[in-house]
Amino acid sequence: SQTTFGPVFEDQPLSVLFPEESTEEQVLLACRARASPPATYRWKMNGTEMKLEPGSRHQLVGGNLVIMNPTKAQDAGVYQCLASNPVGTVVSREAILRFGFLQEFSKEERDPVKAHEGWGVMLPCNPPAHYPGLSYRWLLNEFPNFIPTDGRHFVSQTTGNLYIARTNASDLGNYSCLATSHMDFSTKSVFSKFAQLNLAAEDTRLFAPSIKARFPAETYALVGQQVTLECFAFGNPVPRIKWRKVDGSLSPQWTTAEPTLQIPSVSFEDEGTYECEAENSKGRDTVQGRIIVQAQPEWLKVISDTEADIGSNLRWGCAAAGKPRPTVRWLRNGEPLASQNRVEVLAGDLRFSKLSLEDSGMYQCVAENKHGTIYASAELAVQALAPDFRLNPVRRLIPAARGGEILIPCQPRAAPKAVVLWSKGTEILVNSSRVTVTPDGTLIIRNISRSDEGKYTCFAENFMGKANSTGILSVRDATKITLAPSSADINLGDNLTLQCHASHDPTMDLTFTWTLDDFPIDFDKPGGHYRRTNVKETIGDLTILNAQLRHGGKYTCMAQTVVDSASKEATVLVRGPPG
């Protein structure tokens, strides 16, 4: 029969940035879960369950939500999928549907900008309303004559403004700001009206740098994001830009002579104060600001599917890292879980006492901070089972060495844990100096003799029922070394046979293993120096061929059956040539 299990997400919705002017007619938010029986699906928008009726703009296709002809007014918001089956319910991560737009620049003519040749100048972009952020370029006189990003020109990707550190005659002309919006499946660009740059008489005076495009006093960034700091100065001669981390050195891969400092994938080590210095022959100017690195939640410890016995206690734990420190909350079958009688919710810990069948279901721990939310899911299956030995019966034939000790496990599947009794034949066994039943149900018999032979039955019982399993204890002769290896002194290149003979119970296989200084000897190594005698089962002689100095040491012969073993040692000294 098919195993029953609760929903496990295979596909979850992703946030979508939908262009308001898109020709696309629909948005698809994905959701698919593996479950047995198969899952059914529901969706929430902004925390409220959606009515997904035939013929409406919202359609359920498999588990996916399809929104036809989406509009910002009706459809922008937070979406979440719920997958359910008879075992329980899980909720997906939240997906945000946002609408991107970029309006046109103002149709008004732009005022001319005047500056003395040789001075610095800034041309404002004043981009139109938009979402999300834009990238910027500037056009001089005609398309596609874009302003180069050289040391004299700088286009801020924060404001869109164009900075010229020191103007010259070639800068005369008409300037237009090109703003571009990048969305999930479209790109849109708009141009501003042209603004004329007029240059007055040349001023050849040298002047010290003055930083005009400056990065903020505080820049917040998430681990893994790219961080860009901007710094550009007016000055004559054109200032050189240098960057440094006030509390440490910059990573060598960073370009330190550019107006932008880029950290491709920021980490916590990158947090700190950064300084930009603009310098020329007339002086210097500096600006400082901090990068503050934060992080979305990430799991350090999650819950996993658990089978637990009815009446037992269970403690589940979730832990998440992140900055700010994430809070952890719990859901049962998609609904918030709070402390109540047998269930205690303590932040990252969930504790059950005296589990009951109703506690079965799908559980999720949710970690969140202002940068994101993550979900970990697991199924709790509370079991009530009569003892069952089918998976783990008592060993059918239990060989034991005379005079030795035997452990016979009794491990039926049972919930709650079964109470175990052992019998030999029809006699119930009680603990004695020689016979012990451990708390986990294992039967231990010490100093075994022939009289211990017979049928041993483990009886297991709980409130659900009872079962038993029987094994036959067979007492075998102990293994003994009858001819032990003798210590020897040999010369380099000699051959030596170390004898090892054993007696054992003939109903068992006997294996010989040899070790040198407690390391197993490999007889199958091609071109090796060791050979093993194979003429008779009870003989395990070892021959060393062409002995080398490394073959000296403590040799141990172990004779082993499935019930016991015996071993003896000998020391071999290999002498090298004199001197």
Partner: antibody
Framework: EVQLVETGGGLIQPGGSLRLSCAAS????????MSWVRQAPGKGLEWVSV???????YYADSVKGRFTISRDNSKNTLYLQMNSLRAEDTAVYYC??????????????WGQGTLVTVSS | DVVMTQSPLSLPVTLGQPASISCRSS???????????LYWFQQRPGQSPRRLIY???NRDSGVPDRFSGSGSGTDFTLKISRVEAEDVGVYYC?????????FGQGTRLEIK
């Protein structure tokens, strides 16, 4: 020297009965674990039954309820009583002296086998 | 039941050349006592089976050292370093981890 000699095979009609014997020498049957293994013509090996030194018996599902393993300690002989024989029981039947393993035991020393043919 | 799968089922080999037979079990053959209950048998034409290897790699007494067994868990190999004429026959792997004990289908070794 350990020796096992099977006898009692032959041609038998479906539904009929047959008793196979295995005479042992060089060891005592009663203090050992003894089994029967069969091999259909041109096919592989199939374990049939085992008897432990203490007298406990076990059978393959395919023969359970139809075959009985037993021994005569005085004759140092192992038997396999086969009833309600079917065409698929046609095989060479080997008697074997076992050694202890996790499953209980396994056949190690084998007789030469005796052929049982079930056919109408 | 534990299923034993051998490959190849037929193995033509030149005299003096090596031969290798693979055996895979449907579950691990390691028992709780630490032993691995995998065995190899040889059946020469017209003869009864004879055990060659016990517990994966131990040769039975009288078995030539050109036969070797290796492997662990569920994958095992019988190797013959240099095939001789007397090695012709069918080779079976067998598990004794669980009842019923089960055999592989057999690999027929023949001389090219």
């Amino acid at each position: 020297e350990v020796q096992l000699v099977e006898t009692g095979g032959g041609l038998i009609q479906p539904g009929g009965s047959l008793r196979l014997s295995c005479a042992a020498s060089g060891f005592t049957v009663s203090s050992n674990y003894m089994s029967w293994v069969r091999q259909a013509p041109g096919k592989g090996l199939e374990w049939v039954s085992v008897i432990y030194s203490g007298g406990s018996t076990y059978y393959a599902d395919s023969v359970k309820g139809r075959f009985t393993i037993s021994r005569d300690n005085s004759k140092n002989t192992l038997y396999l009583q086969m009833n309600s024989l079917r065409a698929e029981d046609t095989a060479v039947y080997y008697c074997a002296r076992d050694r202890i393993a996790a499953a209980g035991t396994l056949p190690v020393y084998w007789g030469q086998g005796t052929l049982v043919t079930v056919s109408s | 039941d534990v299923v034993m799968t051998q490959s190849p089922l037929s193995l033509p080999v030149t005299l003096g050349q090596p031969a290798s037979i693979s055996c895979r079990s449907s579950q691990s053959l390691v028992y709780s006592d630490g032993n691995t209950y995998l065995y190899w048998f040889q059946q020469r034409p017209g003869q009864s089976p004879r055990r060659l290897i016990y517990q994966v790699s131990n040769r039975d007494s009288g078995v030539p050292d050109r036969f070797s067994g290796s492997g662990s868990g569920t994958d095992f190999t019988l190797k013959i370093s240099r095939v001789e004429a007397e090695d012709v026959g069918v080779y079976y792997c067998m598990q004794a981890l669980e009842t019923p004990i089960t055999f592989g289908q057999g690999t027929r070794l023949e001389i090219k």
